[in-house]
Interface confidence: low
């Protein structure tokens, strides 16, 4: 049976979803266990012109010392204002000084990056040491690069489409996810549904997705259900500022009781099926419906609270 609920974009003042993911449009992770220099390459596209970026490097200590020196090659397509955090890391940074401006002096060794196309930049980087990771990111707001974490099976890093960078790289896109909403026809009352659908990633290892839900309304005003649907290998850690009904695939736990896993349900894996699930749970409004790539952290801020749905 078709569920009549015409999903339309919701204005950002009614609902916004941001997320952190390891999925990249192109990337690779390789192992270079004996290399003196750990080389990472980032190709960053900023589609709407000048942007600000937080870039954090974290190193895992091995035997109390950083494992090796790091070369980070930063290739950008337009002006970027960079806030770099790389405390205590012996970092060499190669970048285009006419496009990258630092929030504060970087305090690391820097090299001017030649104006090469991507393939030549990879070759240039590989001449300095074996490439541990490379990634192409579209409009990042923040990036976390974990050093000494490479779990790749490759011995040589070659950019491939739709890659999962695992623990090596996590990033947050600047543009929030598209949030849509609709009225479920023929359902009375003020119960609202928040539906989050996480799409399968490139690698299918077990994953926990942390879902932070912040609804700006008084607890007594709220009658809501949170529907979380994802691939079978995804479990959920829920951090919500309101009590609400939970309906998920896989297993879920709450941040306040992380050790208590609760078994979820088998849910439909289509938008139409999930809208039907919301209707079955007596929701009259789908306050937010979001489809995301496989993410590690998802934050939902909404101010619908069973009130009138406003689409943009």
């Amino acid at each position: 049976e078709t569920v009549h609920c015409d999903l339309q974009p919701v204005g950002p003042e009614r609902g916004e979803v941001t997320y952190t993911t390891s999925q990249v449009s192109k990337g690779c992770v390789a192992q270079a266990p004996n290399a003196i220099l750990e080389v990472h390459v980032l190709f960053l596209e900023f589609p709407t012109g000048p942007s600000q970026l937080e870039l954090t490097l974290q190193a895992s200590k091995q035997n109390g010392t950083w494992p090796r020196e790091v070369l980070l090659v930063l290739s950008v397509n337009s002006s970027v204002f960079l806030h770099l955090q790389a405390l205590g890391i012996p970092l060499h940074l190669a970048y285009n000084s006419s496009l990258v401006t630092f929030q504060e002096p970087p305090g690391v060794n820097t090299t001017e990056l030649p104006s090469f196309p991507k393939t030549q930049i990879l070759e240039w980087a590989a001449e300095r040491g074996p490439i541990t990771s490379a990634a192409e990111l579209n409009d990042p707001q923040s990036i976390l690069l974990r050093l000494g974490q490479a779990q790749g099976s490759l011995s040589f890093c070659m950019l491939e489409a739709s890659q999962d960078m695992g623990r090596t790289l996590e990033w947050r896109p600047r543009t929030p996810a598209l949030v849509r909403g609709c009225h479920l026809e023929g359902v009375a009352g003020h119960k609202e549904a928040h539906i989050l659908r996480v799409l399968p990633g490139h690698s299918a290892g077990p994953r926990t997705v942390t879902v932070k839900v912040e609804l700006s309304c008084a607890p007594g005003d709220l009658d809501a259900v949170l529907i979380l649907q994802g691939p079978p290998y995804v479990s959920w850690l829920i951090d919500a500022n309101h009590n609400m009904q939970i309906w998920t695939t896989g297993e879920y736990s709450f941040k306040i009781f992380p050790e208590k896993n609760i078994r979820g349900f088998k849910l439909p894996d289509t938008p139409q099926g999930l809208l039907g699930e919301a209707r079955m749970l007596n929701a009259s409004i789908v306050a937010s419906f979001v489809e995301l790539p496989l993410a590690s952290i998802v934050s939902l801020h909404a101010s619908s609270c069973g009130g009138r749905l406003q689409t943009s």
Epitope: E45, P47, T48, G49, P50, N77, S78, S79, T101, Q103
Partner: antibody
Framework: EVQLVESGGGLVQPGGSLKLSCAAS????????MDWVRQASGKGLEWVAE??????????YYAESVKGRFTISRDDSKNTVYLQMNSLKTEDTAVYYC?????????WGQGTLVTVSS | EIVLTQSPATLSLSPGERATLSCRAS?????MHWYQQKPGQAPRPWIY???NLASGIPARFSGSGSGTDYTLTISSLEPEDFAVYYC?????????FGGGTKVEIK
């Protein structure tokens, strides 16, 4: 409500100078990247200059056509951005708009007319 | 610099008709923004990042495109839609505008 109000336009001789001001209100000015865009009569829009926020070290950028002659500056305490125009040429004659860049030019002033003529 | 060429320069149509405005870039750009301007007024943001309508813009407007070819479409012209529309890119320095397309009443 975002408001941008330009002032300081007028008639000036070639080689002369003029300083435009843009008073901003309705948003956190110190966080904003502010630009000047101009438009000659009956012509299209031309980007002129930009000054970024305090967090961006108030970095400035100019179109090639005005580089070395125009200076963009700002006073965050007065919520005002300025365009100092020196060595003016007849081709600088235009309406000058103050605008805010936030992924695109999302707010514009009404413009101030600068006429360079002898 | 990336040159944006808008066509046609003038589009003469009647209310209710469909309008298709083109913006072609001399090199590939990632996104295109569009602004509307009426005589004696400042430009107004209309469509940003290729396909997103700015605040308060009616749904009869839409934007599309990629690479070097971008389009602004008005599904059914209303009297208030007659104006000049400019495209703009900042995928590459410097920021550039197109020359504009004037949509006039036939």
């Amino acid at each position: 409500e975002v408001q941008l109000v330009e002032s300081g336009g007028g008639l000036v001789q070639p080689g002369g100078s003029l300083k435009l001001s843009c008073a901003a209100s309705g948003f956190t000015f110190s966080d904003a990247w502010m630009d000047w865009v101009r438009q000659a009569s009956g012509k299209g829009l031309e980007w002129v200059a930009e000054i970024r926020s305090k967090a961006s070290n108030h970095a400035t950028y100019y179109a090639e056509s005005v580089k070395g002659r125009f200076t963009i500056s700002r006073d965050d305490s007065k919520n005002t951005v300025y365009l100092q125009m020196n060595s003016l040429k007849t081709e600088d004659t235009a309406v000058y708009y103050c605008t805010r860049w936030r992924r695109f030019f999302d707010s514009w002033g009404q413009g101030t007319l600068v006429t360079v003529s002898s | 610099e990336i040159v944006l060429t808008q066509s046609p320069a003038t589009l003469s149509l009647s209310p209710g008709e469909r309008a298709t405005l083109s913006c072609r870039a001399s090199s590939s750009v990632s996104y295109m923004h569009w602004y509307q301007q009426k005589p004696g007024q400042a430009p107004r943001p209309w469509i940003y990042a290729t396909s997103n309508l700015a605040s308060g813009i009616p749904a009869r407007f839409s934007g599309s495109g990629s690479g070097t070819d971008y389009t602004l479409t008005i599904s059914s012209l209303e009297p208030e839609d007659f104006a000049v529309y400019y495209c703009q890119q900042w995928s590459s320095n410097p920021l550039t505008f197109g020359g504009g397309t004037k949509v006039e009443i036939k």
